[in-house]
């Protein structure tokens, strides 16, 4: 007869490992007992369990409650055992020693491989600001056994770099994604993809990019200068800009305080019926945590009684 086993048994952390050992004997041969031991190189054999044909399974103190016989039906020539709830420390070499009658003793070895699936983590880099050079957008770390694969899935243009740290029974892989920040990247997803033989499917962690910027400011509302005449109602100036984080707006008058009746509503400056008092230089101040911009305009309210044309100077400063 001969023993049938596997060279390698692979199991995911926490699952039960079946350690196979089947005696393929000639007719009339019987298995008396099967002794299982752990036999890692450099260490003495550590008994796991003894499976007796008549008296069942007796488990060593170190494996109490963790070694069982496979569920029925059982073949009397089958010396396989179940190792419950495999942990990383179980990884190693195992030997089954089969005592048969009348053929004598046989032994076979197998290697138990315990896959430790990674639990990846994604850490965003420092705040991204337009105008920076190559900057760390995010790093993704995953530790497992064997070493996991860490890649990136994104439409954003960038560069990646990886490094690996080996531990006694596992390896940690860290991948970094660098980019040159631009406002077009705002809101774009950056996904870390972790692959591992212990995972049924890739694990994905998505980070949404936020790039701080502030666009140039401009003022709208003076396109048709002839509309700015005494008595006109509903006249308004609107400050145009965009940014991340969204900017706040502030209106001032360069040559004095804002006239009474003028309403500030965020990016909009609303005028009461126009009078010559409303003529002056108005400044829109746009700011966010990243930067600030100014844009100023000169308002010249026309008196229809006068023949002289209205002149408007539009100056933008930042």
């Amino acid at each position: 007869g001969e023993l049938e086993t596997s060279d390698v048994v692979t199991v995911v952390l926490g699952q039960d490992a079946k350690l196979p050992c089947f005696y393929r004997g000639d007719s009339g041969e019987q298995v008396g007992q099967v002794a299982w031991a752990r036999v890692d190189a450099g260490e003495g054999a550590q008994e796991l369990a003894l499976l007796h044909s008549k008296y069942g399974l007796h488990v060593s103190p170190a494996y109490e409650g963790r070694v069982e016989q496979p569920p029925p039906p059982r073949n009397p020539l089958d010396g396989s055992v179940l190792l419950r709830n495999a942990v990383q420390a179980d990884e190693g070499e195992y030997e089954c020693r089969v005592s048969t009658f009348p053929a004598g003793s046989f032994q076979a070895r197998l290697r138990l491989r315990v896959l430790v699936p990674p639990l990846p983590s994604l850490n965003p880099g420092p705040a991204l600001e337009e105008g920076q050079g190559l900057t760390l957008a995010a790093s993704c770390t995953a530790e497992g056994s064997p070493a996991p694969s860490v890649t990136w899935d994104t439409e954003v243009k960038g560069t990646t770099s990886s490094r690996s740290f080996k531990h006694s029974r596992s390896a940690a892989v860290t991948s970094e994604f660098h980019l040159v920040p631009s406002r077009s990247m705002n809101g774009q997803p950056l996904t870390c993809v972790v692959s591992h033989p212990g995972l049924l499917q890739d694990q994905r962690i998505t980070h949404i990019l936020h790039v701080s910027f502030l666009a140039e400011a401009s003022v709208r509302g003076l396109e048709d200068q002839n509309l700015w005449h005494i008595g006109r109602e509903g006249a308004m100036l609107k400050c145009l800009s965009e940014g991340q984080p969204p900017p706040s707006y502030n209106w001032t008058r360069l040559d004095g305080p804002l006239p009474s009746g003028v309403r500030v509503d965020g990016d909009t400056l609303g005028f009461p019926p126009l009078t010559t008092e409303h003529s002056g230089i108005y400044v829109c101040h746009v700011s966010n945590e990243f930067s600030s911009r100014d844009s100023q305009v000169t308002v010249d309210v026309l008196d229809p009684q006068e023949d002289s044309g209205k002149q408007v100077d539009l100056v933008s400063a930042s």
Epitope: A35, G44, Q46, E47, A49, L50, H52, K54, Y55, H58, V59, S60, P61, A62, E64
Partner: antibody, heavy 122, light 110 residues
Framework: QVQLVQSGAEVKKPGASVKVSCKAS????????IHWVRQAPGQGLEWMGI????????SSAQKFQGRVTMTRDTSTSTVYMELSSLRSEDTAVYYC???????????????WGQGTLVTVSS | QSVLTQPPSVSEAPRQRVTISCSGS????????VNWYQQLPGKAPKLLIY???LLPSGVSDRFSGSKSGTSASLAISGLQSEDEADYYC???????????FGGGTKLTVL
């Protein structure tokens, strides 16, 4: 060689407690269960309980539950058996015994301590 | 009273054969291995037979064990004076969840 060495004889008063030690050597201490068996003078053997030397988990005969405490110290490969609320009928030789036969995980005691005589007398 | 039943004593002449019986139930002998121990006067017990009929190394093959149903027996052939001792059978008991012993049999070599 494989051996179990027990502590010396004790004389105790009724109601007291006794703690007997059993030091193992010559084998991997945590690989085999240790049992305690006692023998009253002129009487037969009586199983008291079992301890798992790696986890410290114990199980004792119903007769002794609540009175017997088995512990172990893996750093010194020593097992202890403490019997409380002693009475005169607890006078006996107390043995520790290693389970297994020639390194195999068999339910038999192949190595015994030399025994510790505990006398309970007022 | 012991869970396993043995005769209190047996005696036989040197060079003869003697058998010691041990009777139990389905929860012990019927379902578990039987071990036999020899205890010389003033000494700790010594394993003589394990798993019904197996001899540990160093034990004379004059000793043999057997089991049938809920009974077991120890046979000693070619009796010698140094065989004078107490003999105990033992087995795990599934109901009591512990080991049980016979009351012991005193062997006298006449």
């Amino acid at each position: 060689q494989v051996q179990l060495v027990q502590s010396g004889a004790e004389v105790k008063k009724p109601g007291a407690s006794v703690k007997v030690s059993c030091k193992a050597s010559g084998y991997t201490f945590t690989s085999y269960y240790i049992h305690w068996v006692r023998q009253a003078p002129g009487q037969g053997l009586e199983w008291m309980g079992i301890i798992n030397p790696i986890s410290g988990r114990t199980s004792s005969a119903q007769k002794f539950q609540g009175r017997v405490t088995m512990t172990r110290d893996t750093s010194t490969s020593t097992v202890y058996m403490e019997l409380s609320s002693l009475r005169s009928e607890d006078t006996a030789v107390y043995y520790c015994a290693k389970e297994g036969v020639g390194g195999e995980l068999l339910r038999a005691f192949d190595i015994w301590g030399q025994g510790t005589l505990v006398t309970v007398s007022s | 009273q012991s869970v396993l039943t043995q005769p209190p004593s047996v005696s036989e002449a040197p060079r003869q054969r003697v058998t010691i019986s041990c009777s139990g139930s389905s929860s012990n002998i019927g379902n578990n291995a039987v071990n036999w121990y020899q205890q010389l006067p003033g000494k700790a017990p010594k394993l003589l037979i394990y798993y019904d009929d197996l001899l540990p190394s160093g034990v004379s093959d004059r000793f043999s064990g057997s089991k049938s149903g809920t009974s077991a027996s120890l046979a000693i052939s070619g009796l010698q004076s140094e065989d004078e001792a107490d003999y105990y059978c033992a087995a795990w008991d599934d109901s009591l969840n512990g080991f049980v012993f016979g009351g012991g049999t005193k062997l006298t070599v006449l």
